[in-house]
Every structure is written in structure tokens, then in C-alpha cells.
């Protein structure tokens, strides 16, 4: 014998108080699958959470975090504070990157500057708390007699199209 509730589609529930007929989910609730005997309460995105997707009769609301925070956990169950570039989030709050390390994002940890000399290159631009060093050509490339870099093509005058 088929369970009459199996005919109830998503967005409804099988109402035992009304001879197991399919009733629509009440406001602020949903059922994402058919054959449900109850509807689930919609998630409310409050406080540091903000609504990314409204609740419907067939799907739960989805939250993300307000500016200054980012999501953690399944389904954005938690919001973790952002730090500034040049900082990292420790257990006890945002801390500046130590000398020799950088972070160019608002989350994550400070990473060591690239060691240019490991690749036989020189430092072209020094690193900062926010930016990695930029490695330049190797000293051998700068020595006399080394093949020179091809010069750029001369720029065209404005308003002149190529013939």
C-alpha cells in the first residue's frame, strides 16, 4: 500500500490533522523534498549575517557575512573577522606581519617573502608587509655581453592608424 504522504511535493507537508492531505508550508518554513511530514523553519540571517538568498517554500535561506567578515563552516554557519592587508588573524586578534613576511589578502596568514637568491636572481623591488618582493634578472643577465632585452616597438603617434 503506497504511503499517501509520498505524493506531497516539495514546498508542502503531509498534514496528519487533515487526513494526510498535502498542505503548503506555513510562512517562514520550507520543505526541500517531497513526502515530508513537517516543514523546517527558515534560517534567519541576523546580526553579522546577511541574507544572500531568501527562503522559499522549497529551499532554506542562505546567509553570508556583512562587510568586514568572511564565512566559515558549512553553509556559512560562522563569520570570522577580516584583517587588513599586512596582517594575519591569530587566536587573539589581527596582528601585523613580522618583518620578512607579507599578506596581500584580508584573511589567511603571513607568508615569507620569496627568496630571490634561491633562483639565482636579485631583488628588484623590496617586500613589504602587504607585498612580496619582486625578483629581478639574475646577476649573470646584467653582466656585459649578456644578450640584451629586445627593445619595445616605437609607439605610434595618436590618431594615426597603421597603413
Amino acid at each position: 500500500l503506497q504511503d499517501p504522504c509520498s505524493n506531497c511535493p516539495a514546498g508542502t507537508f503531509c498534514d496528519n490533522n487533515r487526513n494526510q492531505i498535502c498542505s503548503p508550508c506555513p510562512p517562514n518554513s520550507f520543505s526541500s523534498a517531497g513526502g515530508q511530514r513537517t516543514c523546517d523553519i527558515c534560517r534567519q540571517c541576523k546580526g553579522v549575517f546577511r541574507t544572500r538568498k531568501e527562503c522559499s517554500s522549497t529551499s532554506n535561506a542562505e546567509c553570508d557575512c556583512t562587510p568586514g567578515f568572511h564565512c566559515l563552516g558549512a553553509g556559512c554557519s560562522m563569520c570570522e573577522q577580516d584583517c587588513k592587508q599586512g596582517q594575519e588573524l591569530t587566536k587573539k586578534g589581527c596582528k601585523d606581519c613580522c618583518f620578512g613576511t607579507f599578506n596581500d589578502q584580508k584573511r589567511g596568514i603571513c607568508r615569507p617573502w620569496t627568496n630571490c637568491s634561491l633562483d639565482g636572481k636579485s631583488v628588484l623591488v623590496n617586500g613589504t608587509k602587504e607585498r612580496d618582493v619582486v625578483c629581478g634578472p639574475s646577476p649573470a643577465d646584467l653582466s656585459p655581453g649578456a644578450s640584451s632585452v629586445t627593445p619595445p616597438a616605437p609607439a605610434r603617434e595618436p590618431g594615426h592608424s597603421p597603413q
Partner: nanobody, 123 residues
Framework: EVQLLESGGGLVQSGGSLRLSCAAS????????MSWVRQAPGKGLEWVSA????????DYADSVKGRFTISRDNSTNTLYLQMNSLRAEDTAVYYC????????????????WGQGTLVTVSS
């Protein structure tokens, strides 16, 4: 599958006490440090306390030092947080979190979280 299940939250008067538990399964519990973190209404995540795999080393946020005590029972795979002298500002959802190594780091470096248990402190 790693699972962390918190319990013990509830409504308590200011100055009162609660003991939170976190039942862990799906990994070698004694091999990993564990932490408690919390999220107060309208606020971001705040780390509360951490404990090493053996339980021999602990650390606390300044806001709970001297009031909260973290402990663990590796024979039953359970993490605890004893909370005394509770204040209204301790109201939050409390999560237990698995660290990635035997010793806890300075970083917010967790790979698994529980679903959380709500602690409400009324003044």
C-alpha cells in the same frame, strides 16, 4: 567521518556556571589539539580557549581567563569547557573545533567544527 557534537548550553543567571561538553568521533582524539570558539549575537567569531592533545597545555582569551577552564578526557573522546562567573557578554553560540595538529598554534587553524550550543546569560 569526523563529528563534533556540543551539549550543555542553556539559560543561566549572571554569576552562574555551566559546563559544556563536546563529544568527538571519527578521528584519533588524543592526537589533536582542540579549541572552543564562540559567536555572540551580531558579532564575529571569537576564540575562547585551546588545549593540546595530551591536555598538558592550555591557553585562554583574556576575556575568559580565570573564569573558564578547558579540559579533555581522551578515554571518552570528550572536550569540556567549565564556565564560572558568567556575564551577559558571554552570551553566544559556543563551538568546539578540531585543530590540525597535536599542539595548538597561534592561528585560527581549524579543520572541523561542531554545530554549536547556545549559552544565554541573563542579567
Amino acid at each position: 567521518e569526523v563529528q563534533l557534537l556540543e551539549s550543555g548550553g542553556g539559560l543561566v543567571q549572571s554569576g552562574g556556571s555551566l559546563r559544556l561538553s563536546c563529544a568527538a568521533s571519527g578521528f584519533t582524539f588524543s592526537s589533536y589539539a582542540m579549541s572552543w570558539v564562540r559567536q555572540a549575537p551580531g558579532k564575529g567569531l571569537e576564540w575562547v580557549s585551546a588545549i593540546s592533545g595530551s591536555g598538558g597545555s592550555t591557553d585562554y582569551a583574556d576575556s575568559v581567563k580565570g573564569r573558564f577552564t578547558i579540559s579533555r578526557d581522551n578515554s571518552t573522546n570528550t572536550l569540556y569547557l567549565q564556565m564560572n562567573s558568567l556575564r551577559a557578554e558571554d552570551t553566544a553560540v559556543y563551538y568546539c573545533a578540531k585543530e590540525r595538529a597535536y599542539d595548538y598554534s597561534n592561528y585560527v587553524d581549524f579543520d572541523y567544527w561542531g554545530q554549536g550550543t547556545l549559552v544565554t546569560v541573563s542579567s
